[in-house]
Structure formats: C-alpha cells, structure tokens
C-alpha cells in the first residue's frame, strides 16, 4: 500500500482522508500544503503556525513517500542545534538516522527539503518556498 | 485556495477529502497515485483501469496545481489521433489549448507528464512510470 505500488492491486476499500484545511493535500491522513511565496525560515514557520500547522516534518519514508516526487527546494521544520551538533524538528524531536541525506551546500542552521529525502543546509535568513504540514489524529 | 497560497490565510474549515482508494493522494477531491514500476503506455492504462481509475487527465491548472511540483516524467492519459492531428484523453475529450505545453522531444503518439504542466511526446511502447487518477463525484 505504498505510494509507489510495485504490483497492481485492486484497493480493498475506498476511504476518506483527513480532516485537513480546505484544499490541502491529504495523504495517509497527513495534510500538506506547498507555498510558493518565498519567506525566510522564521517567516515560513510563522505562516504554518498561523494555519494551525508546522513546517514539514519528515518522520517516515513509508508514510511520506509522496515526498520522493517533490520538485525544487522548500523550507522544512528542521534546525541545527549548535550546542550539541544535532538536527532537530520544531517539536524538539531529533532527526532519525537514515531518514534524510543532509547535504552541506551552504553554511546555516536551517534545512531545505529536496526530492528523494534530501535536506540541504541553508542560511535561515534566505527566502525560499516552504511546506506546511498538519498531522491528523 | 490554491496549492500555492500567495498570502497566509487561516483555513475557514477543516474537511475530509475523497473517498479515494486506500493510501492514494487526495487533493481537491481528486485521487492520485504514482507508480514507480515502469510500464509502456498500454500496460499503464490497464493498471489504472484495474484499480477503477484512469491515467492522469489534466483538466485544470487551478484544481490540479499540485502537478506543478511533480518531479520526473510519468505516463498520462493523453494520446495523439493521427487522422485529425489532435491530442485527446482516454475519455475521448480533446486537450484544451494552453493547459499543457506539448514538447516534441521524441517520435511517438503518447505523452509523458512533467512538472509545470508540460507534456513530452514519447513512443507509446517505451516503459515509464505512470500516474493514475480517480475523480470523485
């Protein structure tokens, strides 16, 4: 039941997805929205928060395999903690090993999501498009 | 209410999307699934049909703006009709002008979808990944 089905299977059931904010993408009961207005990381975070969401959190390659196909670069909710050298999400959880390939393209403490589960380090003050996410319960 | 919101707005309502086959993407009440098993156009069409769906039909830049961000090339349900020179969808409807930019890259009568509403002409017998779509009522 992956986004990338290897073999054709007739779906067992039709089901509803959500709830999500109106006109957001719903996939495996998570809600996603892509914003093409460029903002820095802090402004992007504030934008997501104002919509009762957070910047993208990558927590599962299986549950979020739609992210494989995302074109371009977008702010996600990953920040570098200089004091301990770790990368953590907005909710304080630490980035799990093997979830993202972190690429040190620029010097910075924030990260852009790019297709195929890559994270590009970037200066948090640089404007970029961004992805908001809302997890449904 | 676009996928690409220009200004931050608090969503008026939370809503459910669908119904869709289990674990398909739901967006603006259409269901999408990306398959990474490469098949030729005819096999891709058969795969979608077996799941009560069709190959991707692009009918609206507004309702389908999530397609702007799709990476790579995937079969869609567009075929060339040699006797009248038109491009038409599986359901027999003619491709609307200005919906897709048709790019004459290869010699063929089928088309691959690529990001930003581009259609690349390709030989129908060449294996490619594909996108299935199910429109909800």
């Amino acid at each position: 039941n992956s986004l990338f089905n290897q073999e054709v299977q007739i779906p067992l059931t039709e089901s509803y997805c959500g709830p999500c904010p109106k006109n957001w993408i719903c996939y495996k009961n998570n809600c996603y929205q892509f914003f093409n207005e460029s903002k820095n990381w802090y402004e992007s975070q504030a934008s997501c928060m104002s919509q009762n969401a957070s910047l993208l959190k990558v927590y599962s390659k299986e549950d979020q395999d739609l992210l494989k196909l995302v074109k371009s670069y977008h702010w996600m909710g990953l920040v570098h903690i200089p004091t301990n050298g770790s990368w953590q999400w907005e909710d304080g959880s630490i980035l799990s090993p093997n979830l993202l390939t972190i690429i040190e393209m620029q010097k910075g403490d924030c990260a852009l999501y790019a297709s195929s589960f890559k994270g590009y380090i970037e200066n948090c003050s640089i404007p970029n498009t961004y992805i908001c996410m809302q997890r449904t319960v | 209410n676009s996928l690409f919101n220009q200004e931050v707005q608090i969503p008026l309502t939370e809503s459910y999307c669908g119904p869709c086959p289990k674990n398909w993407i739901c967006y603006k009440n259409n269901c999408y699934q990306f398959f990474n098993e490469s098949k030729n156009w005819y096999e891709s069409q058969a795969s979608c049909m077996s799941q009560n769906a069709s190959l991707l039909k692009v009918y609206s830049k507004e309702d389908q703006d999530l397609l702007k961000l799709v990476k790579s090339y995937h079969w869609m349900g567009l075929v060339h009709i040699p006797t009248n020179g038109s491009w038409q969808w599986e359901d027999g409807s003619i491709l609307s002008p200005n919906l897709l930019t048709i790019i004459e890259m290869q010699k063929g009568d089928c088309a691959l979808y690529a990001s930003s509403f581009k259609g690349y002409i390709e030989n129908c017998s060449i294996p490619n990944t594909y996108i299935c779509m199910q429109r909800t009522v």
Epitope: - | G85, E104, K107
Partner: antibody, heavy 121, light 107 residues
Framework: QQLEQSGGGLVTPGGSLKLCCIG?????????MTWVRQAPGKGLEWIGC?????????YYASWVNGRFTLSRDIDQSTGCLQVNSLTAADTAMYYC??????????????WGQGTMVTVSS | DIQMTQSPSSLSASVGDRVTITCRAS??????LNWYQQKPGKAPKLLIY???SLQSGVPSRFSGSGSGTDYTLTISSLQPEDFATYYC?????????FGGGTKVEIK
Amino acid sequence: QQLEQSGGGLVTPGGSLKLCCIGSGFDFNTYWMTWVRQAPGKGLEWIGCIHGGSSGSTYYASWVNGRFTLSRDIDQSTGCLQVNSLTAADTAMYYCARPGYRSWSKTFDLWGQGTMVTVSS
Amino acid sequence: DIQMTQSPSSLSASVGDRVTITCRASQDISESLNWYQQKPGKAPKLLIYAASSLQSGVPSRFSGSGSGTDYTLTISSLQPEDFATYYCQQANSFPLTFGGGTKVEIK
C-alpha cells in the same frame, strides 16, 4: 519522402496567387503541413499550418489577418496556400514544410524547394 | 507572440574554430527550441530539435543546450561546409516564431 511546390510567379499589387505543395512517400493525411516565407535577404517568417487529415485544423500567424488561407486535398496529398490582396511586402520565397513525425506540428525536417512570389507593377 | 532574439547577427570565423550562437526567448519556452541551417538558394535544414537533440544525419560537431529563455548552438570545430546562416525557432506555442538569423562567414 518529398514535398514538391508549384504556383509561384509575378503578380501585380492587389492580385492573388495559389501556391501548392504535393507530398509523396508518406501518409499525408496524418501530418501537419506548414508554410514559411522569406523575403529577399531577410529571415524566416512562419505563416501557418494545416492538418492533412479529416479535421483540416489550422493555425495562423497573428499578422496574417485573413489575407492568407490554408487548404488541403486529402485525395491528392496536396496542401495549398491562397494569398490575396498582395503587396510588395509579400515578395518572398514561400516554403512548405512537414514535421519530423505525425504527432509533431512545430518541428520541420522535410522542406519543399521553395517557390518565389514577386509582387510588382 | 513569443519574440526570439538571436545574437550575433553575423560573425567571421576560420575553419577549426569553435562557434557559439545564442538565442533568447521573450518567455520560458521549456526547451522547445529548434535550430536550422540555411545556405543561399536552399531551404532550411533542421540541425537540432528540443534544444539539444541532434537531428539524424547531422554531424556531431553541432550541439545545442539551454533551458528557460536562453539557448545556445555550438559548432565545436567549424568546417568549410558550415558557412551558412543559422536560425533558431521556438516550438513552444503557436504562433511559431524564428530568430533573426546569424550569418557565419569566412574570416
């Protein structure tokens, strides 16, 4: 596969002319036929195109303004360009061209030899 | 209509030289760009289609590149038979438009 053109010549201002292009060696009714012109010493200028099949769909350059009309005869594998109200500015070599594949309409790999139209009193 | 601006309008070069011709579109044309060669008294000949695909039978010294609005035709080592006029043409949308041409002359 070839395109053979006919119908050029000298015409007086305000006059009309019909240029034709016969296709051979390919399935004419599945291809788009395009017309391009070139004034002496100048660049290429697209006029328009017509599908050789049952629809006879056409596209024209914005400057044509109804003075030029494309037609085709499926049985004769022929595409024609009717040019009306000719002026000196229409003096040019007129080419017909065919795309490289039947689903293409904008990329031309087969060209006629060209036919010269001279508008002069 | 999409405007196509070609540069230079003419250039002088010697046999063996590397020659580059550029073409700029007034809007993004998604790699839908063709290059043609024309010799005096002859019809144009397709060299490159879809920005970088070499037409069958065309020597490999011809190459095309570019994306968005900016495109380039390169002749890696100019041969005597390459002295001609070159045109770009956008194949993105109707009405189709050509660049003004670049005449490659013998230095």
